[in-house]
Amino acid sequence: QGGAAEGVQIQIIYFNLETVQVTWNASKYSRTNLTFHYRFNGDEAYDQCTNYLLQEGHTSGCLLDAEQRDDILYFSIRNGTHPVFTASRWMVYYLKPSSPKHVRFSWHQDAVTVTCSDLSYGDLLYEVQYRSPFDTEWQSKQENTCNVTIEGLDAEKCYSFWVRVKAMEDVYGPDTYPSDWSEVTCWQRGEIRDACAETPTPPKPKLSK
């Protein structure tokens, strides 16, 4: 995502189609308060950021309210009046959906249905990963609504679950970010557990997009 302009690297994250975060890393200007100027319409004047992110006392990014703006962000990072990086980008390329909310588990013998609140926009995948202490890696199942049924579980085993949301690659492109994971929830015999006690250190989840 970054650019080569004067050695400025940028990162854009569009949180849940609500807030855009643009951060920069400019070694040449590491002790400088660069300013961030932006607009959502190519015909408007630039506004200056009012919500800077700071790193070691210097500006390193900007948070923008961009709710219901699914198109273009025009921006300029400046050292005084001198632009050091200028770009215009489709924001949805950098979508990061919000983490699943109101995650619920409904058990029926050897199957569980995991549900959560669907986000207000579409073309998303809701992924549930789960494992028992006897599994060497996480198993995964995903659906395009937050209603995921996993069958063939062993009622006697303790299972850990967590859920996340991903933007469909065919729609949003391959450079989006998956949501943060929901909290891990542990279940055994249809009842919630504090932990799966006999679980060894869990392996890292598959980072499939």
């Epitope: 995502q1 970054g2 390329y93 391959p174």
Partner: antibody
């Protein structure tokens, strides 16, 4: 399978206007998730994106051309249009209409018409 | 706007050769880079999307790679019908832009 056929090209005098049409068949231009674009190719073979119109009628234009072009559509005729004003010699090009990949205005162009040649000359 | 620079501008190759065309972007664009083939007197045809994703109906000898600012289109075992001009295009930057093209001639 979508088919796109452009028409309306020809010889135009400098300062004049043109209106190009693009008739789509085999696919509705109002299908959700698709954007339609005009792209031109200069005699030297360089390609320039001109603008989009979406399934929702939203338009985006190349800033370099924004003051001179308008993209519109007629749903009943399943057709797109490009209106271009104040033409100059450097607007001489083959004009293509094309469809974006599903997902909208952000992507590559997977279906193209055969193009229509516009020559601007006195 | 994001400038895409292709190299070489022109290449003359013999059938069955392996051909590599590069495209460099003036700003990083992740993997949102697409490749087109245009044969004489035809319109461009999408070959590869998102740097390396294949397109249905395109021969498997065409492949793409790269991310960030540097991208490559590779044609393995070139065939006579591959004589064409090849263009790269970026999509996250506005406006979308194309490379200047690489003309491939078959000896």
């Amino acid at each position: 399978q979508v088919q796109l056929v452009e028409s309306g090209g020809g010889l135009v005098k400098p300062g004049g206007s043109l209106r190009l049409s693009c008739a789509a068949s085999g696919f509705s231009i109002t299908t959700s998730g698709y954007y339609w674009t005009w792209i031109r190719q200069f005699p030297g073979k360089g390609l320039e994106w001109m603008g989009y119109i979406g399934y929702n009628s939203k338009t985006y234009y190349n800033p370099a051309l924004k003051s001179r072009i308008t993209i519109s559509r007629d749903n009943a005729k399943n057709s797109l249009y490009l209106q271009m004003n104040s033409l100059r010699a450097e607007d001489t090009a083959v004009y293509y209409c094309a469809r974006s990949l599903y997902g909208g205005y952000k992507d590559a162009f997977d279906s193209w018409g055969q193009g229509t040649l516009v020559t601007v000359s006195s | 706007e994001i400038v895409l620079t292709q190299s070489p501008d022109f290449q003359s190759v013999t059938p069955k050769e392996k051909v590599t065309i590069t495209c460099r972007a003036s700003q990083s664009i992740g993997t949102s880079l697409h490749w087109y083939q245009q044969k004489p007197d035809q319109s461009p045809k999408l070959l590869i999307k998102f740097a390396s994703r294949s397109i249905s109906g395109v021969p498997s000898r065409f492949s793409g790679s790269g991310s960030g600012t540097d991208f490559t289109l590779t044609i393995n075992s070139l065939e006579a019908e591959d004589a064409a001009t090849y263009y790269c295009q970026q999509s996250p930057g506005f406006p979308p832009t194309f490379g200047q093209g690489t003309k491939l001639e078959i000896k």
